[in-house]
Amino acid sequence: VSPTFQVVNSIAPVQECSTQLDIVIVLDGSNSIYPWDSVTAFLNDLLKRMDIGPKQTQVGIVQYGENVTHEFNLNKYSSTEEVLVAAKKIVQRGGRQTMTALGIDTARKEAFTEARGARRGVKKVMVIVTDGESHDNHRLKKVIQDCEDENIQRFSIAILGSYNRGNLSTEKFVEEIKSIASEPTEKHFFNVSDELALVTIVKTLGERIFALEA
């Protein structure tokens, strides 16, 4: 205010504008993910750290395997509590193939649209969780470039469980999932030994996501 108590060009509180993120979580729900409860536990731990609301952080969830399903849109729920209840109810949809490029592309093209609740000028964040090399990895270069063009920040998580259970080399898989993550890779890529270990990265992942708000 001015000395005469007139309102002059006011600036919104830093905290209010800095808590706005549109986050879409892209979940691999193909048959090899096991146990699914570990995924929902991870979601629960991650989401409860978020201040969710129409003027704060919004969260949408997409699940993919062979095909892609919008579990819920960014603007579907207006509180953390509502989102937690909805996330707990997400069932594993299965699928013999892991179409990660399709999952990411669908999130970019559809989940981040205004029709599904995305807000103009609000930072877009995608969190991709998968446990295996994609069958459509030959389409990833384009999909990632499209995300770059739209300034979508990507965090990728590689679950090594099925590889470790089968005593398989994780090298190609890790390389692929690293390629999905935004730069710098070391701040945007995570890998966990199995599905149960997902909860161990929640704190760091949450901190890194919310560091984007600044």
């Epitope: 062979e66 892609v68 592309d105 459509d136 270069k141 384009k142 063009d149």
Partner: antibody
Framework: QVQLQESGPGLVKPSQTLSLTCTVS??????????WSWIRQHPGKGLEWIGY???????YYNPSLKSRVTISVDTSKNQFSLKLSSVTAADTAVYYC?????????WGQGTTVTVSS | EIVLTQSPGTLSLSPGERATLSCRAS???????LVWYQQKPGQAPRLLLY???SRATGIPDRFSGSGSGTDFTLTISRLEPEDFAVYYC?????????FGGGTKVEIK
């Protein structure tokens, strides 16, 4: 709008290397939203995907031809190229280049390559 | 590799009739990765439909597509003289990208 044009010799001798170039006009090959493909069609037959390249140089080939195929890109010339080694009469076909986004939406007119001595 | 089988091989119809073309995959294909092309003699193929059912730019609405999993269909509601050609389905979700063998739509 974007147009593609194939060029290269129409006749190649058996055991030699077939070399074709596709020139892109009306748009930049460096726009990262497309793959740049090669497809061929044997006389009176269907279409066969040979492979494609991303502007960054990443390539993807049909396993049935992989040992003989090289696709490269020259962003400064807005061109991409196909080399197919050790050709035989079975490689006689019309060769097309195409832009691949969500399906191949722009094609060259095709160039006929005959393998014969 | 995913094998796409198109049927019938040839379809003999008159202008104004409805054409129904089938494309069957040897394993499940995401509809987002299924496309249809039209090819006329001496010409390059032309993209008709992507995502199994979305019309490409400039494609008239008499062309429509449907299907999921392993069975896909291209329908031309009323054949125009310029529609007599060969039609190919293609999948690009799995490498190698593969095409069907084609269906020739000819004038009866």
């Amino acid at each position: 709008q974007v147009q593609l044009q194939e060029s290269g010799p129409g006749l190649v001798k058996p055991s030699q290397t077939l070399s074709l170039t596709c020139t892109v006009s009306g748009g930049s090959i460096s726009r990262g939203n497309y793959y740049w493909s090669w497809i061929r069609q044997h006389p009176g037959k269907g279409l066969e995907w040979i492979g494609y390249i991303f502007y960054s140089g990443s390539t993807y080939y049909n396993p049935s031809l992989k040992s003989r195929v090289t696709i490269s890109v020259d962003t400064s010339k807005n061109q991409f190229s196909l080399k197919l080694s050790s050709v035989t009469a079975a490689d006689t076909a019309v060769y097309y280049c195409a832009r691949d986004g969500y399906g191949m939406d722009v094609w060259g007119q095709g160039t006929t390559v005959t393998v014969s001595s | 590799e995913i094998v796409l089988t198109q049927s019938p091989g040839t379809l003999s119809l008159s202008p104004g009739e409805r054409a129904t073309l089938s494309c069957r995959a040897s394993q499940s294909v995401s509809s987002s990765y299924l496309v249809w092309y039209q090819q006329k003699p001496g010409q390059a193929p032309r993209l008709l439909l992507y995502d199994a059912s979305s019309r490409a730019t400039g494609i008239p609405d008499r062309f429509s597509g449907s299907g999921s999993g392993t069975d896909f269909t291209l329908t031309i509601s009323r054949l125009e003289p310029e529609d007599f050609a060969v039609y190919y389905c293609q999948q690009y979700g799995n490498s190698p990208l593969t095409f069907g063998g084609g269906t020739k739509v000819e004038i009866k």
